[in-house]
Interface confidence: low
């Protein structure tokens, strides 16, 4: 019967000619009376075979990821008469794995979007590279993720590639980030080869600022002939959120005579202060109120950053209309 | 581990000045907003004051405002509370306490620093 | 602001019985944003129950906590010798208030 072991033979071997190892008859006496032959795709261009030992050599480099095992075919004739020792064979050369590929993230480019202020381990993407070395084979293609650029910000779970917050973000302050990972193979030992990737993180807002009024205290003045409904001026309120999250409202705080009124304008961000009574000069004229501003729309969760409205005083002065 | 540690108490005159301080350590300080909580002898919790996170927003009780201070040093993980024109009414052992991320209930406290005021 | 109001003042229990601790607000609080605390002798508060009835990291499950609007309950199913302390209630809805605390005692 034929005797040989598995065959095995590295990738990306630079020699002319690599011993792979023997294929024999146990009929083969050792007196050069067999011939060995090899049949089938890499036969005679990528393997040979030493027709009177069996002897079997690798002439080309070969590469794993481009074909990992080749089945051949033995053949063993007595050179006496011609006839085949052993029934043919097939048998099968395995090309092992060397660490010749670089991890690669193959989902570029990457962008996530995450809410500022979100807490400390808060998930923010998974990035992943593929390492065309052989999984199986030691750790060519075992890798780990780490952290080049982005701390203190995220972190990277080193076996996943979750990409995580470590520290709270402010959108007011800084509205996105780039975070560089780099995957390494070989679970980092020596000899790793090393692939990286950019991650584009965009904060995305939180109403985590409250209205401010510009100024503590508006002048206005008011004509005692001003019907009720008469816009008599406006105030500001300013607020570093953006979007629906900076939206407000203005009302009244305080207004003993209940004379005025404040309304908002929703696209100028505006409050008006009107007129909800008419005034008389003779009878008082000043008056003194106070507005609240608040924004319009505040989940529960961040009412924590909402606690005491800003406020703002605001004199009116009745100016004085001749009578008839 | 993850502890606060208040200091500066101390016996004053009314009218007079302390400044407490309360060192933070085994988590990330500068995420969390602080706040000072006080509990004069035999009586039950006041709160006093908070800072946020990034120190940008104060808040104080009304008892107190006009006269403390809250501040933090987030490089240092400290944070202070400057407490001027005592009143013996402000005797109390004062806690520093972290709110919590996602609330603002406090999920840590210090073991407190005891400020007499008398005369 | 909010004023909270517990209730018994002191509760005198033995070891293995149930204690039943109450905390009723001036005005209606989302019951989100309840919490109750353990204080020990000399000692800081503990957390223990916050959103109304989320027990706190280590906290065991013989505590709980229930209520909504103006009334909340801490309940200990079972007092463990540990257990004796002052228990407060706190609302942070609306600024911060805590109530006047219950003392639980061994009877």
């Known amino acids: 019967g034929w005797v040989w072991n598995q065959f095995f033979v590295p990738e990306e071997m630079n020699t002319t000619s690599h011993h792979i190892g023997q294929l024999r008859s146990d009929l083969d006496n050792g007196n050069n009376s067999f011939q060995y032959k090899l049949l089938g795709a890499g036969a005679g261009s990528t393997f040979i075979i030493d027709e009177r030992t069996g002897d079997i050599y690798a002439i080309q480099k070969l590469d794993r990821e481009e074909r990992s095992l080749y089945i051949l075919r033995a053949q063993v004739i007595d050179i006496a008469t011609g006839r085949a020792v052993e029934p043919e064979s097939e048998f099968v050369i395995k090309v092992s794995d060397i660490n010749d590929n670089e991890p690669k993230f193959l989902d570029e480019p990457y962008e996530a979007i995450v809410p500022e202020m979100s807490p400390e381990g808060t998930l923010v993407i998974q990035v992943t590279a593929s390492d065309a070395d052989d999984p199986s084979s030691g750790n060519n293609a075992r890798l780990l993720y780490s952290l080049l650029q982005g701390q203190p910000y995220f972190s990277v779970e080193p076996t996943t590639g979750v990409i995580r917050i470590s520290s709270k973000m402010d959108r007011e302050l800084q509205d996105e980030y780039w975070v560089i990972i780099q995957a390494k193979d070989m679970i980092g030992q020596p000899g790793a080869l090393s692939g990286t990737t950019s991650v584009l993180i965009k904060l995305s807002d939180v109403n985590d600022n409250k209205p401010i009024f510009k100024e503590s205290l508006y002048r206005l003045t008011v004509s005692e002939s001003a019907p009720t409904g008469t816009s008599i001026g406006t105030i500001m309120a300013y607020d570093n959120d953006i979007g629906e999250n900076a939206e407000m409202d203005y009302s009244i705080e305080e207004d003993d005579s209940q004379t005025f009124d404040i309304i908002t304008n929703h696209e100028t961000q505006e409050g008006i202060v009107i007129l909800k009574k008419k005034v008389d000069f003779e009878h008082q004229n000043h008056y003194g109120i106070r507005a609240k501003v608040k924004n319009h729309h505040v989940p529960e969760q961040l009412m924590k950053y909402h606690t005491e409205a800003s406020t703002t005083f605001i004199k009116i002065q009745v100016e004085d209309v001749d009578e008839p | 581990q993850v502890q606060l540690v208040e200091s500066g108490g101390g016996v004053v005159q009314p009218g007079g000045s302390l400044r407490l301080s309360c060192a933070a350590s085994g988590f990330s300080f500068s995420s969390y907003d602080m706040d000072w909580v006080r509990q004069a002898p035999g009586k039950g919790l006041e709160w006093v004051a908070v800072?946020?996170?990034?120190?940008?927003?104060?808040y104080y009780a009304d008892s107190v405002r006009g006269r403390f201070t809250i501040s933090r040093d987030n490089s240092k993980n400290t944070l202070f509370l400057q407490m001027n024109s005592l009143r013996v009414e402000d005797t109390a052992v004062y806690y520093c306490?972290?709110?919590?991320?996602?609330?603002?209930?406090?999920?840590?406290w210090g073991r407190g620093t005891l400020v007499t005021v008398s005369s | 602001e909010i004023v909270l109001t517990q209730s018994p003042g002191t509760l005198s229990l033995s070891p293995g019985e149930r204690a039943t601790l109450s905390c009723r607000a001036s005005q209606s609080v989302s019951s989100s944003y309840l919490a109750w605390y353990q204080q020990k002798p000399g000692q800081a508060p503990r957390l223990l129950i916050y959103?109304?009835?989320s027990r706190a990291t280590g906290i065991p499950d013989r505590f709980s906590g229930s209520g909504s609007g103006t009334d909340f309950t801490l309940t200990i199913s079972s007092l463990e010798p540990e257990d004796f302390a002052v228990y407060y209630c706190q609302q942070y809805g609306s600024s911060w208030t805590f109530g006047q605390g219950t003392k639980v005692e061994i009877k």
């Open positions: 959103g109304a009835s």
């Open positions: 800072i946020w996170y990034d120190g940008s927003n104060k």
């Open positions: 306490a972290r709110e919590t991320g996602e609330g603002w209930y406090f999920d840590l």
